[in-house]
């Protein structure tokens, strides 16, 4: 699997999940959160080749196609596959909630 | 939606499915299937900015870190959504066999 | 790379006020969280504050509600702690230190305040 | 306010042992605490953060451990240079307390 136990501890060059660090400040303007300052989000990248983690029958058609016309736009592209949730702390008025927001750590990588 | 009613009809600049027609032998070397010889596959092409059609929670935040940083390679990448099946002929020694290929044709797309 | 430069020892008398400051160099100053913390004599540390340069934000430990007041100067790279009021107890060790992924990454070298009549 | 509870208070130990120290929040941190190191007449020095990652430069002798409200660090084979005061910190809402040390 493209996960962070293998991407992390390789130097692989095809679709993989990539360390990635979001402050909610700098990054994003956000200032309603109030913990954590960022977290790690991490990312999706690297090529998709022919047979590289194909998520679907047309990802494997379009991989091909592209191997075939290595000038075309038209290529399979690495995007997340699991996702985490990230628990938060923020405020309403002066109370502290804790919250869980959904789909917010990459995992996984595939082609899609 | 970023489907082909939309997308087909405009020139939508941003994410969104574009026509592909893919013919088996040329662009796949596939000489099993008998019909069709190809058929329009379509893909999904296109940058994802902040609020354009954005899958997930971190879908969003990875657009607006973009937003922020825009020389950053870490950006969403427009994939398909909603996929087709598509009927095709090949042979068994001389017997023809009907079969739906799941996932083949892209008829929409979303920022992943 | 990161350094936090803090200034020299100071010595007050109770009921009085100390300013000290920390030279940031080497990270975006007004993109970090700078935190504040202290350690008296013998004893363990204690978190105080934090500020966020960029817009001056400021969270506070609510023990020195009232008494300490942080502030940042974007032009010089340069955050400041003033605490009032000094008693006894506030003797101790001053530290600058900024805020990274859930921790504070690099520390000022340390002002000691000594409060004395 | 969140409360720390390290132990033990003080331990002694020859080198080459394996060491565990212990932190317990009083709710759930989730991951967010760090472990600090420190000399006698020094600054902290941070080891670990969020809970399992080694900071740069720290021997891969030290680990973290843990989440929720139940937090180790581990010295895995104890050097005669790593006789220090050892402390833990939530940064799960302010204020970030510390551990009373160990």
């Known amino acids: 699997a493209l996960d962070t136990n293998y991407c992390f501890s390789s130097t692989e060059k095809n679709c993989c999940v990539r360390q990635l660090y979001i402050d909610f400040r700098k990054d994003l303007g956000w200032k309603w959160i109030h913990e954590p300052k960022g977290y790690h989000a991490n990312f999706c990248l690297g090529p998709c080749p022919y047979i590289w983690s194909l998520d679907t029958q047309y990802s494997k058609v379009l991989a091909l196609y592209n191997q075939h016309n290595p000038g075309a736009s038209a290529a399979p592209c690495c995007v997340p596959q699991a996702l985490e949730p990230l628990p938060i702390v923020y405020y309403v008025g002066r109370k502290p909630k804790v919250e869980q927001l959904s789909n917010m750590i990459v995992r996984s990588c595939k082609c899609s | 939606a970023l489907d082909t009613n939309y997308c087909f009809s405009s020139t939508e600049k941003n994410c969104c499915v574009r026509q592909l027609y893919i013919d088996f032998r040329k662009d796949l070397g596939w000489k099993w299937i008998h019909e069709p010889k190809g058929y329009h596959a379509n893909f999904c092409l296109g940058p994802c900015p902040y609020i354009w059609s954005l899958d997930t929670q971190y879908s969003k935040v990875l657009a607006l870190y973009n937003q922020h940083n825009p020389g950053a390679s870490a950006a969403p990448c427009c994939v398909p959504q909603a996929l087709e099946p598509l009927p095709i002929v090949y042979y068994v020694g001389r017997k023809p066999k009907v079969e739906q290929l799941s996932n083949m044709i892209v008829r929409s797309c979303k920022c992943s | 790379q990161v350094l936090l430069v803090q200034s020299g020892a100071e010595v007050r008398k109770p009921g009085a006020s100390v300013k000290i400051f920390c030279k940031a160099s080497?990270?975006?100053?007004?993109?970090?969280?700078m935190n504040w913390l202290r350690q008296a004599p013998e004893q363990g540390l204690e978190w105080m504050g934090q500020i966020y340069p960029g817009d001056g934000d400021t969270n506070y430990n609510g023990k020195f509600k009232g008494r300490l007041t942080l502030t940042a100067d974007t032009s010089t790279n340069t955050a400041y702690m003033e605490l009032s009021s000094l008693r006894s107890a506030d003797t101790a060790m001053y530290y600058c230190?900024?805020?990274?992924?859930?921790?504070?990454?690099?520390w000022g070298q340390g002002a000691l305040v000594t409060v004395s009549s | 306010e969140i409360q720390m509870t390290q132990s033990p208070s003080s331990l002694s130990a020859s080198p080459g042992d394996r060491v565990t120290i212990t932190c317990r929040a009083s709710?759930?941190?989730?991951?967010?605490l760090a472990w600090y190191q420190q000399k006698p007449g020094k600054v902290p020095k941070l080891l670990i953060y969020a809970a399992t990652n080694l900071a740069d430069g720290v021997p891969s002798r030290f680990s973290g451990s843990g989440s929720g409200t139940d937090f180790t660090l581990t010295i895995s084979s104890l050097e005669p240079e790593d006789a220090a005061t050892y402390y833990c910190q939530h940064f799960w809402g302010t204020p970030y307390t510390f551990g009373g040390g160990t």
């Open positions: 230190a900024r805020h990274y992924d859930g921790s504070t990454d690099y």
């Open positions: 080497g990270y975006s100053f007004t993109s970090s969280w």
């Open positions: 709710e759930n941190i989730y991951s967010n």
